[in-house]
């Protein structure tokens, strides 16, 4: 029985050119995390394997940095980065847990209605 839950950073609105951190945390289970995959739509961005460490997909190497922890840092954001990101926790013996984060990247001039952007 899968008892765990995934907590995420929550949805994020950010400014073009900035950087953000996507993070998930698996709690309420004693299952062992064997691997965490980060995906956007059907694209694999990165893998953090418990034994082999991090692998960043070649097409994202310039703009994606591993960490902090099992999270992912996206840099030099573009409007095209807008979309849903998935953290997929592969665990034993529970199986797979998935968290979802929606990132909206806006042009600097589009700070409508006094939006506060997150640029660490």
């Amino acid at each position: 029985m899968m008892t765990g839950t995934i907590e995420t950073t929550g949805n994020i609105s950010a400014e073009k050119g900035g950087s953000i951190i996507l993070q998930c945390h698996l709690s309420s289970t004693t299952a062992q995390v064997t691997q965490v995959n980060w995906e956007q739509q059907d694209q694999l961005l990165a893998i953090c394997n418990a034994d082999l460490g991090w692998h960043i997909s070649p097409s994202f190497k310039d703009r994606v940095a591993p960490g902090p922890g099992l999270g992912l840092t996206l840099q030099s954001l573009t409007v095209n980065d807008t979309g849903e990101y998935f953290c997929i926790y592969h665990t034993y013996p529970d199986g797979t847990y998935t968290g979802r984060i929606f990132l909206e990247v806006l042009e600097s001039s589009v700070a409508e209605h006094g939006a506060r952007f997150q640029i660490p």
């Epitope: 950073t9 949805n11 994020i12 807008t82 849903e84 909206e104 806006l106 939006a115 660490p120």
Partner: antibody, heavy 119, light 112 residues
Framework: EVQLQQSGPELVKPGASMKISCKAS????????MNWVKQSHGKNLEWIGL????????SYNQNFRGKATLTVDKSSSTAYMELLSLTSEDSAVYYC????????????WGQGTSVTVSS | DVVVTQTPLSLPVSFGDQVSISCRSS???????????LSWYLHKPGQSPQLLIY???NRFSGVPDRFSGSGSGTDFTLKISTVKPEDLGMYYC?????????FGGGTKLEIK
């Protein structure tokens, strides 16, 4: 003036599929997400999902995966929602609504499309 | 999914009353950068829902200043300082911080 004009009411048979349209005007269509919302029994509101016109991305409420498919035609500034394998549970009013940039909410709504599933 | 609970379900009022509607979420609606995506809508019979408040407390364009929003974390409130006839209808809160977005069950503002 921002306007979202939805297609008219539909009476469809169980098991059939149908597509609702939402024609946008008065703003740059590709610059905003388009959301879809279901209202059942004249009360409960449920977020179905959204489409990102500028890169083709989507985000769905898992409860509607396999039930709703969201698309757009950028050339006509029209968003579509196809509803599949309809049952009586899908009888509802469906709204399209423009995303409010930077705030994960919806600012302008279509007038709604009533869908009745009945044999 | 985040569960959003609105109270009361029904709110009988007289015109001129000050009223409050509460919205509570099953987890915090502040994201990791401290932003909270909570909005309020009014849905009148025969019309489309209309945005009143976004980002907890920002009034949308054209919304009268008798409407105000407040709160943080998991507890939020919509206040109407002086109820007018055109304010009657169903009020909904919406959380957009976590996927999927979820609405409260609604509060019916009706005449006593």
């Amino acid at each position: 003036e921002v306007q979202l004009q939805q297609s008219g009411p539909e009476l469809v048979k169980p098991g059939a599929s149908m597509k609702i349209s939402c024609k946008a005007s008065g703003y740059s269509f590709t610059g905003y997400t388009m959301n879809w919302v279901k209202q059942s029994h004249g009360k409960n509101l449920e977020w179905i999902g959204l489409f990102i016109p500028y890169n083709g991305g989507t985000s769905y409420n898992q409860n509607f995966r396999g039930k709703a498919t969201l698309t757009v035609d950028k050339s006509s500034s029209t968003a579509y929602m196809e509803l599949l394998s309809l049952t009586s549970e899908d009888s509802a009013v469906y709204y399209c609504a423009r995303g409010l940039r930077g705030f994960f909410s919806m600012d302008y709504w279509g007038q709604g499309t009533s869908v009745t599933v009945s044999s | 999914d985040v569960v959003v609970t609105q109270t009361p379900l029904s709110l009988p009022v007289s015109f001129g009353d000050q009223v409050s509607i509460s919205c509570r979420s099953s987890q915090s609606l502040a994201n990791s950068y401290g932003n909270t995506y909570l909005s309020w809508y009014l849905h009148k019979p025969g019309q489309s829902p209309q945005l009143l408040i976004y980002g907890i407390s920002n009034r949308f364009s054209g919304v009268p200043d008798r409407f105000s929003g407040s709160g943080s974390g998991t507890d939020f409130t919509l206040k109407i300082s002086t109820v007018k006839p055109e304010d009657l209808g169903m009020y909904y809160c919406l959380q957009g911080t976590h996927q999927p977005w979820t609405f409260g069950g609604g509060t019916k503002l009706e005449i006593k």
